[in-house]
Interface confidence: low
Amino acid sequence: AEAVWTAYLNVSWRVPHTGVNRTVWELSEEGVYGQDSPLEPVAGVLVPPDGPGALNACNPHTNFTVPTVWGSTVQVSWLALIQRGGGCTFADKIHLAYERGASGAVIFNFPGTRNEVIPMSHPGAVDIVAIMIGNLKGTKILQSIQRGIQVTMVIEVGKKHGPWVNHYS
């Protein structure tokens, strides 16, 4: 059992290319940093894996379609939005996100767990910030993205709690 750090989340929803500059921000303390994650702030556009069956990102060939901002080939800083489960470990998911160029990984819990979060153990996948959020929060974000809304998350280090029991997948 180890201590766990919560994550402050500032999430914004914005409909792209409408000419409307107003963004709705939502601040909460609803995430927890992974046990092997850097304890650092990070921000980026949330991007789920491509394809309806790829939410768990357990296939090593999983891709992410990342928006561009600087020019036709330049990706914004982005955070992979991945669902827990699917037969692979947290480390597998986070490492895949890192390999694809994500600045962080946001893992959302299984369906049916509502807003429950757990401390993730992901040895070896230590290059990017990794947090877990609840299923309800993750599903809300995912559905927004699927409707064409750009969702951005700013993650800041919260408070220390613990000890909790670690989970690897």
Partner: nanobody, 118 residues
Framework: QVQLQESGGGLVQAGGSLRLSCAAS????????MGWYRQAPGKEREFVAA???????YYADSVKGRFTISRDNAKNTVYLQMNSLKPEDTAVYYC????????????WGQGTQVTVSS
């Protein structure tokens, strides 16, 4: 609000080098994507290089292998090392910072003039 202050521009002979700096100040709570654009006389502003939070770098084809972008996160500063400069690199160079609350709308610096003589 975010303010950007560029420096390092000037006049240099072809084949020479310059190092541009851009310091961001203001309401910055997390590290941001930062980059450089340029605008030559009579032309549109064009992308030069960018670096994201994860230190992934991007370059326009015209500057690959000659320009290097880097950043100092502690100082919220981005640098552009320009080597083997050519007359066609002559332009006003603009620093840009991408903020997450204004999608696709970077903050721009005032620009710094780079002139490469032949």
């Amino acid at each position: 609000q975010v303010q950007l202050q560029e420096s390092g521009g000037g006049l240099v002979q072809a084949g020479g080098s310059l190092r541009l700096s851009c310091a961001a100040s203001g309401n910055i709570s997390v590290q941001l994507d930062m980059g450089w654009y340029r605008q030559a006389p009579g032309k549109e502003r064009e992308f030069v290089a960018a670096i994201n939070q994860g230190t992934t770098t991007y370059y326009a084809d015209s500057v690959k292998g000659r320009f290097t972008i880097s950043r100092d996160n502690a100082k919220n500063t981005v640098y552009l090392q320009m080597n083997s400069l050519k007359p066609e690199d002559t332009a006003v160079y603009y620093c840009a910072v991408y903020l997450y609350d204004i999608w696709n709308h970077p903050y721009w610096g005032q620009g710094t003039q780079v002139t490469v003589s032949s």
